[in-house]
């Protein structure tokens, strides 16, 4: 019963992690730059994401532009895009695998097989969480590096966007969910021999005669 609860908790966290990853990867809030206008007032804020950049004016008006050319994008951005998509697909696969092997479903009858399926799902979700972490941490590192780089103009120094924080949270949820699914897996039990401890194995009688133990009084 406790393992069923852990499974449900793990899957819930993984679903939240998947949704968080989806939102984080989709939103253009990876890098944020504020441009100061006349009278030291923030005139524009530029948001940059994996798929588009947006400019938000002081009036509140926002305009976004989707990156039209893949070739014009830096390689790290292309890699971040790819990792995000792979992580989303992998997490989805992990969730589907987890549902297949969950205690509360009857897709698989064999308990041992169920345990192995849930363990596989946990590993997949852990991997998905790591894949989300890579572009998020890489982008954060680049922003911080630029911030302390004297060759980068003050006006161009970016801040960490909300998508990065959301990405960290999503990665944590995926990994936590995956970890819990791995923990629900009972340790492999050594089967006790049915007969006396002998140095050789006794062939199964039921296999030879077609009779079961229940046939004996």
């Amino acid at each position: 019963m406790a393992s069923t609860g852990l499974e449900l908790l793990g899957m819930t966290l993984a679903v939240l992690g998947w949704l968080g990853t989806l939102v984080s990867c989709a939103l253009p809030l990876w890098k944020v730059t504020a441009f100061i206008g006349n009278s030291i007032v923030v005139a524009q804020v530029v948001w940059e994401g994996l798929w588009m950049s947006c400019v938000v004016q002081s009036t509140g008006q926002m305009q976004c532009k989707v990156y039209d050319s893949l070739l014009a994008l830096p390689q790290d951005l292309q890699a971040a895009r790819a990792l995000c998509v792979i992580a989303l697909l992998l997490a989805l696969l992990g969730l589907l695998v987890a549902i297949t092997g969950a205690q509360c479903t009857t897709c698989v009858e064999d308990e041992g097989a169920k345990a192995r399926i849930v363990l596989t799902a946990g590993v997949i979700l852990l991997l998905a969480g790591i894949l989300v972490l890579i572009p998020v941490c890489w982008t954060a590192h680049a922003i911080i590096q630029d911030f302390y780089n004297p060759l980068v103009a003050e006006a161009l120094k970016r801040e960490l966007g909300a998508s990065l924080y959301l990405g960290w949270a999503a990665a944590a949820l995926l990994m936590l969910g995956g970890g819990l699914l791995c923990c629900t897996c009972p340790p492999p039990q050594v089967e006790r021999p049915r007969g006396p401890r002998l140095g050789y194995s006794i062939p199964s009688r039921s296999g030879a005669s077609g009779l079961d133990k229940r046939d004996y009084v």
Epitope: S53, V55, K65, Y67, A153, L156
Partner: antibody
Amino acid sequence: QVQLQQSAPELARPGASVRMSCKASGYTFTTYTMHWVKQRPGQGLEWIGFIIPSSGYTEYNQNLKDKTTLTADKASSTAYMQLTSLTSEDSAVYYCARQFSLITTGFGYALDYWGQGTSVTVSS
Amino acid sequence: DIVMTQSRKFMSTSVGDRVSITCKASQDVSTAVAWYQQKPGQSPKLLLYWASTRHTGVPDRFTGSGSGTDYTLTISSVQAEDLALYYCQQHYSTPLTFGAGTKLELK
């Protein structure tokens, strides 16, 4: 400080080709996009195109696309522009200019540092 | 292509005057407008970008404003060294386009 040093003036015959250079210093060459701008005598500014030195990706003004080839050498932090099939219309000062913004694509095409210009005169 | 129109080719002014140079875009450029100053025999120099953000080292007498399609560069108190050609440019999308320029000259 940031400097863009352009090559010497060119005198060319109609139909010939010229290749000019723009050597960048004082910043990380591969981080910023390099643009080229044309200015005919007594006229305004006309954008030619840009090159992203890190990837070699180029984008051109459709009106000048067939005439221009932009390249960049990361090792020497130098951008190049080749003009082919020269006519009197190509007599102008050509500037290389660094894109100010690091914004990946869209919105950020202001040009903060400009070379001193390379004068091209096409005459028979 | 986005067309940038500077309606006035020349503007006469005196030292100490306040002067405004206007620029109109053929479509909404979402404040992605830069202003350049060019003196004879020199290359253009970036003054403002994002319509109102001053570039490093630009005196605060240069201010910019505008949104949508209409943009203005204002020099609050013209100095002798400000007599030059001023170009607006949209940095919204490629192909980048410039206005024809407005020459600021003494009365």
